[in-house]
Every structure is written in C-alpha cells, then in structure tokens.
Interface confidence: low
C-alpha cells in the first residue's frame, strides 16, 4: 500500500475532527464603524446575513460545506471583553497595555460603551483593539476569559496611527473541516469552503455597496491541503 492509503486508513481510525480552515477577509473594512461591525459579528444587533451568521449556517450544513466547527468571531469576543469592567487595563505612567491579572499601579481602561448595542465608540474601538489582542485569557475566576491573545493574536492584522489608534486590516476566522478520509472528501471540502467564501464575498460587497463607500473586499478559504487538491476541481474541463 502507498503511504497515502496508510495515511487515510489511520485518519479513518483515529481522527474525530478535520484540518483547520481559515476564512480570510482581505483588508478594507472599517471595523470601528457600527454598520460594518454588524456585517461581521454574530451576536445581538448583528445582521442575519453577517459573516459570522453565514459561517454558523455553513457549520449547520456539514454534508455540503464540510465544516465541523464554526469559526469563533474575534469581533464578538472583543465586544464581550470590552464590556467587562476589569479586563482592559493600562499603565497610568505611559498608557500602555497592562495584563488583566495585574493590580496596582495598573488601572481599568473604563471603556465607554454606546447605544443599545453597548459597544465601544469608534475612537475607543481603535484604541483598545491591540490591548484585546495582547490580553491572555484568565481562567482563575476573574471572568476575563475572552482575552484575544491565544485565539486571535495571529488572526487580526492592524496598523497603528498616532500611537493610539489601530486600523484593523486583514483578518481570518478559523474553524475546522469535518473528518476528511478520502480524496473525494478532500476536494469536496475545498469546493464547499470556496462556495461558502464566495457567498460571504458577495454578501459583504452587496452590503458595502449600500454604504456607498466604494470598498470591495474578498473572502477566501485556506487550509493546508488545498494546494494538493485544487487540480481535482478543474481536472475534467482541463482534459476536454
């Protein structure tokens, strides 16, 4: 038997979740804008056709999408983290980030939350995104389990302006494929993820168009095995 056959046999026998899949959203979104946030997030006040909602719907339909675990949304976790009074902290001497488990001299950020949504305003949003992405979840009972460093430290790109404002660029949302045992599973999973991403791209750009800001973005999926199976999707047309 080939090593590939053996690999599939072991997968079949021992694995209960598939490879990670990353849905990458290219830069261009203004995440500090509430309407834009509602196109991405997955909790109350978010759009029913938001990115998070569609990824959740995809996870509920694994036979077609091959998604076994819905991607977590850094944006929703950031909202939750910012609403907890003692999770965001700073050093008063230079206003730099302070871990949530530190006491004096660190102080609570006191993030101002606005509207029914209870989200940070635009300035506060950009001010504290880097703090969230540096904060390590605390499991000792403080309630600050939503710190974003572990889950999203690599998932959110941002550029700093004026030392205090972070403009979020490209981001990714990591989920997991279902268990993939055969070649058919692998290229079907690639196809399914591309269809989900195409729907996300179309929805986001349609909604952005209504904002009249001229931005277009792209959502594409990535998993380690895609490069080996891309040719399967075009094999028949290519041979004709």
């Amino acid at each position: 038997d080939s090593f590939q056959t053996k690999y599939f046999q072991y997968l079949n026998r021992y694995l209960n979740i598939g490879p990670p899949v990353y849905f990458v959203v290219t830069e261009g979104l203004n995440y500090s804008d509430m309407d834009t946030q509602n196109m991405i997030c997955g909790t109350r006040f978010c759009r029913p056709d938001s990115l998070s909602m569609q990824l959740y719907a995809a996870y509920r339909n694994p036979n077609e999408t091959y998604i076994a675990q819905p991607p977590n949304s850094w944006l929703d976790d950031y909202f939750d983290w910012s609403a907890l009074p003692n999770c965001c902290k700073y050093f008063p001497s230079n206003s730099s980030f302070c871990p949530n488990d530190r006491g004096a001299p660190c102080k609570a950020c006191g993030i101002a939350l606005e509207g029914d949504e209870q989200r940070p305003n635009s300035t506060e949003f950009e001010r504290y995104v880097p703090f969230f992405l540096q904060d390590i979840p605390d499991t000792s009972g403080s309630g600050c389990v939503k710190g974003g460093h572990a889950a999203y430290g690599q998932a959110v790109n941002y550029k700093m302006f004026n030392k205090t404002q972070a403009h979020v660029g490209a981001t990714y949302y990591q989920g997991y494929h279902t268990v993939l045992k055969t070649s058919l599973d692998y290229y079907s999973a690639l196809k399914g993820a591309r269809e989900v991403a195409a729907n996300l791209t179309e929805t986001l750009n349609r909604n952005l168009k209504h904002q009249l800001n001229g931005t277009t973005i792209n959502v594409f999926p990535y998993s380690v095995f895609y490069v080996f199976y891309e040719q399967y999707l075009t094999m028949w047309p290519d041979t004709l």
């Epitope: 109350r44 029913p48 569609q54 959740y56 719907a57």
Partner: nanobody, 123 residues
Framework: QVQLQESGGGLVQPGGSLRLSCAAS????????IGWFRQAPGKERSFVAA????????YYADSLKGRFTIARDNAKSMVFLRMNNLEPEDTAVYYC????????????????WGQGTQVTVSS
C-alpha cells in the same frame, strides 16, 4: 401542530398601502421569531422582514427603503406587515414563517410556513 395563516393581500394601486396579517396557532408565539418572505412570478423566494420573539429586534431587506414595517401582538398571536408606497415590483405572494433563530432568517429558511397571500400592485 404549528399553523400560520396569512391574510390582507389584494389588488392595490402604485403608491397605495396594505397591511398583511399572520395568525399563529398550535404553538406559543412568544417562543418564535417571525419573518415575512415573498416570491414574485418566475423569481426565487426572498426575505422581506423579521421580528424577534419579544419584538425588540426587527430586520428588513435593504431593498425596501423603509417602506415596510413589521410588528407583532403576542397576546393575539398575530404578526403584521405594514406596506406603504407600494410599487409594481412588490407584486408577489407573501409568506409568513416562524423559527427560533431570528438571526439566521436570511441564510437558513425557518421551519414553519404559511400558505401565502397574493399582493398585486397595478394601476
């Protein structure tokens, strides 16, 4: 058994108004989000509006430009869709549907549907 019954459709001139009603029976309306969908001749069914179980959140299709309003009266087990400034493009069969997840109405069709009521906008 969950039942939804739409009423209030009919023929109306462009610029006119209608109020559609959806009567629910066989279940507790308070537990369900309700949405309105429509299907024009030769087109796919599309989302119009939704309201969550306690009426605190509503959501509308972008194309409606604020002309439609969804409301509910849980005490009477009724949901309403007020349609103002109607256009010929609004001609369709209007369906009311119920589901427990308000947030996914536009991506995942809810499980319970009425029979529909015809709305025709024509001069």
């Amino acid at each position: 058994q969950v039942q939804l019954q739409e009423s209030g459709g009919g023929l109306v001139q462009p610029g006119g108004s209608l109020r559609l009603s959806c009567a629910a029976s066989g279940f507790t309306l308070d537990d369900y989000a309700i949405g309105w969908f429509r299907q024009a001749p030769g087109k796919e069914r599309s989302f119009v509006a939704a309201i969550d179980s306690n009426g605190s959140n509503t959501y509308y299709a972008d194309s409606l430009k604020g002309r439609f309003t969804i409301a509910r009266d849980n005490a009477k087990s009724m949901v309403f869709l007020r349609m103002n400034n109607l256009e010929p493009e609004d001609t369709a069969v209007y369906y009311c549907a119920a589901g427990q997840n308000f947030w996914t109405f536009t991506t995942t069709p809810p499980p319970y549907w009425g029979q529909g009521t015809q709305v025709t906008v024509s001069s």
